[in-house]
């Protein structure tokens, strides 16, 4: 079952899946000026069994100029901005699959891929949160979210994480700020499942065990 919604937005935090549950789908998308190769795949799917899973198919992009069958609507302004947290500067070091049966590693980058990877997660997927550079974590519990099925509908659990600026007055647990959406857009219109292949981990060592997962696996 696909998780129909995005993992929760936490102000000044990003999230990352350490590995992808079997059944996860990754859209094959290309950056501006590039298209999928002729007869290219629409998506990749994490398939397999409890002992071994891998991504079926692969995504490939080519320059738009080489195809005369394309039409391109002018992108919205937000699509033309520079990559920020979604920058893919280097391939990640994937989590050791031996400890995660039924999961796929992060697919390696493909040439001219889009600035964001759009994953469609399945029930049971877990994502981990950490504060962005310049913010530190205040914890009430695990900084993670799990997609669960309840009453026939999917939902993500709320991560127990507050990210506060160094100079800000620390918030007390329970005094969470309203959840903000990127660029002030309504949550239903924020980019979908923006999970990135490089987290540019520069968070303080004072952050928590969850953060150490990021730094050890991805720095």
């Amino acid at each position: 079952e696909l998780c129909d919604d995005d993992p929760p937005e936490i102000p000044h935090a990003t999230f990352k899946a350490m590995a992808y549950k079997e059944g996860t789908m990754l859209n094959c998308e290309c950056k501006r000026g590039f298209r999928r190769i002729k007869s290219g795949s629409l998506y990749m799917l994490c398939t397999g069994n409890s002992s071994h899973s891998s991504w079926d198919n692969q995504c490939q992009c080519t320059s738009s100029a080489t195809r005369n069958t394309t039409k391109q609507v002018t992108p919205q302004p937000e699509e033309q901005k520079e990559r920020k947290t979604t920058e893919m500067q280097s391939p990640m070091q994937p989590v050791d699959q031996a400890s995660l049966p039924g999961h796929c590693r992060e697919p390696p980058p493909w040439e001219n891929e889009a600035t964001e990877r759009i994953y469609h997660f399945v029930v049971g997927q877990m994502v981990y949160y950490q504060c962005v550079q310049g913010y530190r974590a205040l914890h009430r519990g695990p900084a993670e979210s799990v997609c669960k099925m309840t009453h026939g509908k999917t939902r993500w659990t709320q991560p127990q994480l507050i990210c506060t600026g160094e100079m800000e007055t620390s918030q007390f647990p329970g005094e969470e700020k309203p959840q903000a959406s990127p660029e002030g857009r309504p949550e239903s219109e924020t980019s979908c499942l923006v999970t990135t292949t490089d987290f540019q981990i520069q968070t303080e060592m004072a952050a928590t065990m969850e953060t150490s997962i990021f730094t050890t696996e991805y720095q």
């Epitope: 129909d4 859209n27 007869s39 795949s41 079926d56 699509e79």
Partner: antibody
Framework: QVQLQQPGAELAKPGASVKMSCKAS????????IHWVKQRPGQDLEWIGY????????EYNQKFKDKATLTADKSSSTAYMQLSSLTSDDSAVYYC????????WGQGTTLTVSS | DIQMTQTTSSLSASLGDRVTISCRAS??????LNWYQQKPDGTVKLLIY???RLQSGVPSRFTGSGSGTDYSLTISNLEQEDIATYFC?????????FGGGTKLEIK
């Protein structure tokens, strides 16, 4: 629950254009591609193209690249397909469908091109 | 483009029967094969995706199998509500293409 709502019928004259809609509900519109499919009686289903509502990125079947134009309006969670220079060959049922493997479909819009 | 062929355009079966509908691709589609059901009123529903994955809410009497270029949909214990036309589709590469459909009727 997930729904894709399409008007039941459209009537247009040869040479004219028509713009049909597909209103999405029950999910976050920008998270999933919207595909369009043509069905004529006694013929195979034909994929026209898709739009990614998040970015307005479109891909078309070569056969329909000069016939169809796909757009999306995020504010109303509605995808549109405009068909131009209509002929009797364009008379068909047109479906919108969601996602990479077409997991939900609209009820279809029957387009009749007649003078 | 990849051609999808459903050699049987119609078939009749009795309630309770086990029915198999086949589909062949003109080239290897790496299991990127989906099955759809179209009811007489035109309603279309995804049954199986990626060869054998049952779509949420679809009864378990529907199963899919196959690999390479040859795929099949099996309906065990046929029910009245299964009367419909069944289409296969490849989503391995653009453009996605459909089989011609197999119309299932009750004897």
């Amino acid at each position: 629950q997930v729904q894709l709502q399409q008007p039941g019928a459209e009537l247009a004259k040869p040479g004219a254009s028509v713009k049909m809609s597909c209103k999405a509900s029950g999910y976050t519109f920008t998270r999933y591609w919207i595909h369009w499919v043509k069905q004529r009686p006694g013929q195979d289903l034909e994929w026209i193209g898709y739009i990614n509502p998040r970015t307005d990125y479109t891909e078309y079947n070569q056969k329909f690249k000069d016939k169809a134009t796909l757009t999306a309006d995020k504010s109303s969670s509605t995808a549109y397909m405009q068909l131009s220079s209509l002929t009797s060959d364009d008379s068909a049922v047109y479906y919108c469908a969601r996602h990479g493997y077409f997991d939900y479909w609209g009820q279809g819009t029957t387009l009749t091109v007649s003078s | 483009d990849i051609q999808m062929t459903q050699t049987t355009s119609s078939l009749s079966a009795s309630l309770g029967d086990r029915v198999t509908i086949s589909c062949r691709a003109s080239q290897d589609i790496s299991n990127y094969l989906n099955w759809y059901q179209q009811k007489p009123d035109g309603t279309v529903k995804l049954l199986i995706y990626h060869t054998s994955r049952l779509q949420s809410g679809v009864p378990s009497r529907f199963t899919g199998s196959g690999s390479g270029t040859d795929y099949s949909l099996t309906i065990s214990n046929l029910e009245q509500e299964d009367i419909a036309t069944y289409f296969c589709q490849q989503s391995n590469s653009l453009p996605p293409t459909f089989g011609g459909g197999t119309k299932l009727e009750i004897k």
